[in-house]
């Protein structure tokens, strides 16, 4: 969390924002929350990029206004216009580029003062595994796979029976590119795996953790995932 | 420490080119806009071009649009200025200068390279 | 282009006084302007941006104020080290463009 002040002048309002992390292709949120205006006409929002020589997105008198928006995020950006007399600066970013990591400040001017805080925002691709038996390999053989990661991740297997162990010597990992040539197809092979065991296969990079449970009994497979995007600090 | 130096400025013909080049140093310069601002002998200053910290994006003054090409080479941590077709009028010391967020003014300057066009 | 339109061209204080900048633009630049100090031979150094935030290692006696298209500058008690020329720039649209400065001496 970043909370961010205005300095001098008029007044300062208190601004505050979320690093966040973005995934490639889909949409993503820049969260930024301030202290409400009772006129929605005086509020003034601004999204800057470091290094960007034009806007991000600018919100004034209760409309977009555009005209000095940068090239780089044109048709890509929309603010929640019926939150903002309640305090969301929040922006809506389409698409999301790898080249769109970066620091962003959110700047908010009002009849009460001005303030601004910034976000550090990462891209990647990150994406929910699935844990399945290989009824094709020759020794009880579990396949791991997530069809969208990036940077590349690591891949880490566990057992609840064997807590600890390593698994690195009887697992094979391999990371196959993507049409798009960005992103990557991760698929890690368990071998020599016992039953009534429950397996996690944890896939991470510096974006997000996801894992992938498998629990295979004589009688039935259960199986469950979960995502985690990693660094969300506020300011 | 955080540091620009220009180079490149010296004596031209009218019509002439010239290269100026800033080097920078003591921050992440990829993250930075640049920019570059004349000022005549004895004049006042003026705003003459930018680029963005990628350098896909640039911006020029009308007075040296079609003539002037900035550029950047990141890895070298070194910004440009491609000066073709010079006038009398173009006479100055070149700056660069660098700004972070594009409304919040240049927090840091070149020292200066003086370019003179005379026959 | 915006114009800005800087006053005085000049002006002489004396130690301790207080000096007045002022700053306009041909149309709304919002809050976005900035000043800056250029003492002979060197290049010129950011004071103060977006209208009224100090930059950072600069003194406190510089302030500045405004919006839309009427800006001012203060130095609240004039210093023999502040002997140079303020300009005034605004960022609001390219081309970002400079006032044409205001020459301080000292009495």
């Known amino acids: 969390l970043i909370i961010g002040f205005g300095i001098s002048g008029r007044h300062s309002i208190t601004v505050t924002t979320v690093a966040s992390a973005g995934n490639i292709g889909e949409d993503g949120i820049l969260s930024c929350t301030f202290e409400p205006d009772i006129k929605l006409s005086d509020i003034v929002i601004q999204w800057l990029k470091e290094g960007v020589l034009g806007l991000v997105h600018e919100f004034k008198e209760g409309k977009d206004e555009l005209s000095e928006q940068d090239e780089m995020f044109r048709g890509r950006t929309a603010v929640f216009a019926d939150q903002v007399i309640v305090g969301n600066a929040s922006l809506r970013l389409k698409n999301v580029q790898l080249t769109d990591a970066g620091t962003y400040k959110c700047y908010i001017i009002t009849s009460k003062g001005k303030g601004n805080a910034n976000l550090e925002y990462k891209t990647g691709a990150f994406s929910m595994p699935e844990v399945n038996v290989d009824y094709n390999a020759s020794s009880e053989t579990l396949r791991c796979e997530a069809p969208r990661w990036f940077p590349q991740p690591t891949v880490v297997w566990a057992s609840q029976v064997d807590q600890g162990a390593n698994f690195s010597e009887v697992s094979n990992t391999s990371f196959e590119l993507n049409s798009e040539n960005v992103t990557m197809k991760v698929v890690s092979v368990l071998y020599n795996v016992t039953i009534n065991n429950t397996y996690s296969c944890m896939i991470e990079n510096d974006i997000a953790k996801a894992t992938g449970d498998i629990k295979v009994t004589e009688s039935e497979i259960k199986r469950r995932s979960h995502l985690q995007l990693l660094n969300s600090k506020a300011s | 420490e955080v540091q620009l130096v220009e180079s490149g400025g010296g004596l031209v013909q009218p019509g002439g080119s010239l290269r100026l080049s800033c080097a920078a140093s003591?921050?992440?310069?990829?993250?930075?806009?640049m920019h570059w601002v004349r000022q005549a002998p004895g004049k006042g200053l003026e705003w003459v071009s930018a680029i963005s910290g990628s350098g896909g994006s640039t911006r020029y003054a009308d007075s040296v649009k079609g003539r002037f090409t900035i550029s950047r080479d990141n890895s070298k941590n070194t910004l440009y200025l491609q000066m073709n077709s010079l006038r009398a009028e173009d006479t100055a010391v070149y700056y660069c200068?660098?700004?972070?967020?594009?409304?919040?003014?240049?927090?840091?300057w070149g020292q200066g390279t003086l370019v003179t066009v005379s026959s | 282009d915006i114009q800005m339109t800087q006053s005085p061209s000049s002006l002489s204080a004396s130690v301790g006084d207080r000096v007045t900048i002022t700053c306009q633009a041909s149309q709304d630049i919002s809050n976005y302007l900035n000043w800056y100090q250029q003492k002979p031979g060197k290049a010129p150094k950011l004071l103060i941006y977006?209208?009224?935030n100090l930059e950072t290692g600069v003194p406190s006696r510089f302030s500045g104020s405004g919006s839309g298209t009427d800006f001012t500058f203060t130095i609240s008690s004039l210093q023999p080290e502040d002997i140079a020329t303020y300009y005034c720039q605004q960022t609001d649209n390219f081309p970002y463009t400079f006032g044409q400065g205001t020459k301080v001496e000292i009495k």
């Open positions: 977006d209208a009224s």
């Open positions: 200068a660098r700004g972070r967020w594009s409304k919040w003014g240049f927090d840091v």
């Open positions: 003591g921050f992440t310069f990829s993250s930075y806009a």
